[in-house]
């Protein structure tokens, strides 16, 4: 039967307002049918929308009745309208896109990590630290130490020595684990996972107890 275009999955078109963080990928879909098979075109704020209208371009997937924009930026905000038509009629749907500028934050460390450990003399120990960060994090493992019999400097901040930090060939995954082999009584004490990015730092600490 011949006929005007109609939506084939209207339940998937309910969400007319889309708010996404900057740098995400956005896909608008207008699945339709009709006979003859209708064409689909896209408008932004009521005007024809083409790839050259945005940095990074757009992907039009006519088979899937979709418009895809990768790495969205604030200038992508607006009303996007799909126009589906054949010679018997046309239908349209408008979506509103809001691009949220993510406010950068210091790294977030998973609660409970690293965990306190008790180990037997001569055994191996692993401390784990899970880091979440928008900006590239710089991870360090610190051990709290004493200097001239004191655990803190003159200003009251704890003395630490850096045990492990990023090397040129060290992956983030490797840095999320601190391995101690053949532990001695000197290894006992407080260990800190410290993660910093361009915004600031976060740290979690755990204790190692070494038993004879």
């Amino acid at each position: 039967d011949t006929g005007a275009p109609y939506w084939t999955r209207p339940e998937r078109m309910d969400k007319k307002l889309l708010a996404v963080p900057a740098a995400n990928t956005v896909r608008f879909r207008c699945p339709a049918a009709g006979n003859p098979t209708p064409s689909i075109s896209w408008l932004k704020n009521g005007r024809e929308f083409r790839g050259e209208h945005r940095i990074g371009g757009i992907k039009l997937r006519h088979q899937q009745w979709s418009l895809v924009m990768e790495s969205v930026v604030p200038s992508d905000r607006g009303n996007y309208t799909c126009v589906v038509e054949n010679k018997f009629g046309s239908i349209r749907q408008t979506y509103t896109l809001d691009v949220l500028e993510r406010s950068p934050h210091r790294p977030i460390l998973q609660a409970g990590l690293p965990a306190n450990q008790t180990a037997v003399l001569g055994s191996d120990v692993e401390f784990h630290c899970k880091v979440y960060s928008d900006a590239q994090p710089h991870i360090q493992w610190l051990k709290h130490v004493e200097v001239n019999g004191s655990k803190v400097g003159p200003d009251g901040t704890p003395y630490v020595t850096v045990l492990k930090t990023a090397g040129a060939n060290t992956t983030d995954k490797e840095l999320e684990v601190l391995s101690l082999h053949n532990v001695t009584f000197e290894d006992a004490g407080e260990y800190t996972c410290l993660a910093g990015n361009s915004i600031g730092f976060s740290h979690h600490s755990a204790w190692l107890v070494v038993l004879p």
């Epitope: 210091r106 710089h138 400097g153 901040t157 003395y159 630490v160 020595t161 930090t165 990023a166 915004i199």
Partner: antibody, heavy 126, light 111 residues
Framework: QVQLVQSGAEVKKPGASVKVSCKAS????????MHWVRQAPGQGLEWMGW????????NYAQKFQGRVTMTRDTSISTAYMELSSLRSEDTAVYYC???????????????????WGQGTLVTVSS | DIALTQPASVSGSPGQSITISCTGT?????????VSWYQQHPGKAPKLMIY???NRPSGVSNRFSGSKSGNTASLTISGLQAEDEADYYC??????????FGGGTKLTVLG
């Protein structure tokens, strides 16, 4: 982005003091140590010391102890370096530099300078 | 009182590779994997190029690389370009006086 903006050039007489400021923006001022490094004309870099903006604690290079004072005002994210009893050999460009030392610890083996101020020329001349 | 020893000058032609050495002792360069390198153009502030011996901050060209063997750290610049002409300083932690710099190396790009 991180910015360190220093006060303008100074001309001082021998025996006088000079106080150079360094205003930080684009990051949490109290999270990173602030260091001071100087460079005499045609010479290399010379480390003078650090201040921990979080605690106010300081550590000065042996050479400058007794003559240098480093302070900070956290309310305006500004660090200061005052050098007293100036002599002609103190003529140099003085830089503040953000140290990659987390200010809630005292590191005993680590650190580098990831951001620098534009420098302040201090001329000591009679 | 310069703690770390660098050659006063090195030179190379565009496209070549050069290496700048930084020699210390077991109480600074040799004792820790925490050497950094700075580039300084005339009249400008130093700029961090390498940290933790071999890491590059974001935005620094991968033509710059760092390494360390024993008490000597090295900065290598490959595919030399005119804009690489500058002074280069190494810096390390010293367990006697906290922070030490090398005396600096003037890199001249011939041509």
């Amino acid at each position: 982005q991180v910015q360190l903006v220093q006060s303008g050039a100074e001309v001082k007489k021998p025996g006088a003091s000079v106080k150079v400021s360094c205003k930080a923006s684009g990051y949490t001022f109290t999270s990173y140590y602030m260091h001071w490094v100087r460079q005499a004309p045609g010479q290399g870099l010379e480390w003078m010391g650090w201040i921990n903006p979080n605690s106010g604690g300081t550590n000065y290079a042996q050479k400058f102890q007794g003559r240098v004072t480093m302070t900070r005002d956290t309310s305006i994210s500004t660090a200061y370096m005052e050098l007293s009893s100036l002599r002609s050999e103190d003529t140099a460009v003085y830089y503040c530099a953000r140290g990659y030392w987390y200010a809630y610890f005292t590191y005993i083996n680590y650190g580098y300078f990831d951001n620098w101020g534009q420098g302040t020329l201090v001329t000591v001349s009679s | 009182d310069i703690a770390l020893t660098q050659p006063a000058s090195v030179s190379g032609s565009p496209g070549q590779s050069i290496t700048i050495s930084c020699t210390g002792t077991s109480s600074d360069v040799g004792g820790y994997n925490y050497v950094s390198w700075y580039q300084q153009h005339p009249g400008k502030a130093p700029k961090l190029m390498i940290y933790d011996v071999s890491n590059r901050p974001s935005g620094v060209s991968n033509r710059f690389s760092g390494s360390k063997s024993g008490n000597t750290a090295s900065l290598t610049i490959s595919g030399l370009q005119a804009e690489d002409e500058a002074d280069y300083y190494c810096q390390s932690y010293d367990n006697n006086s906290d922070v030490v710099f090398g005396g600096g190396t003037k890199l001249t790009v011939l041509g």
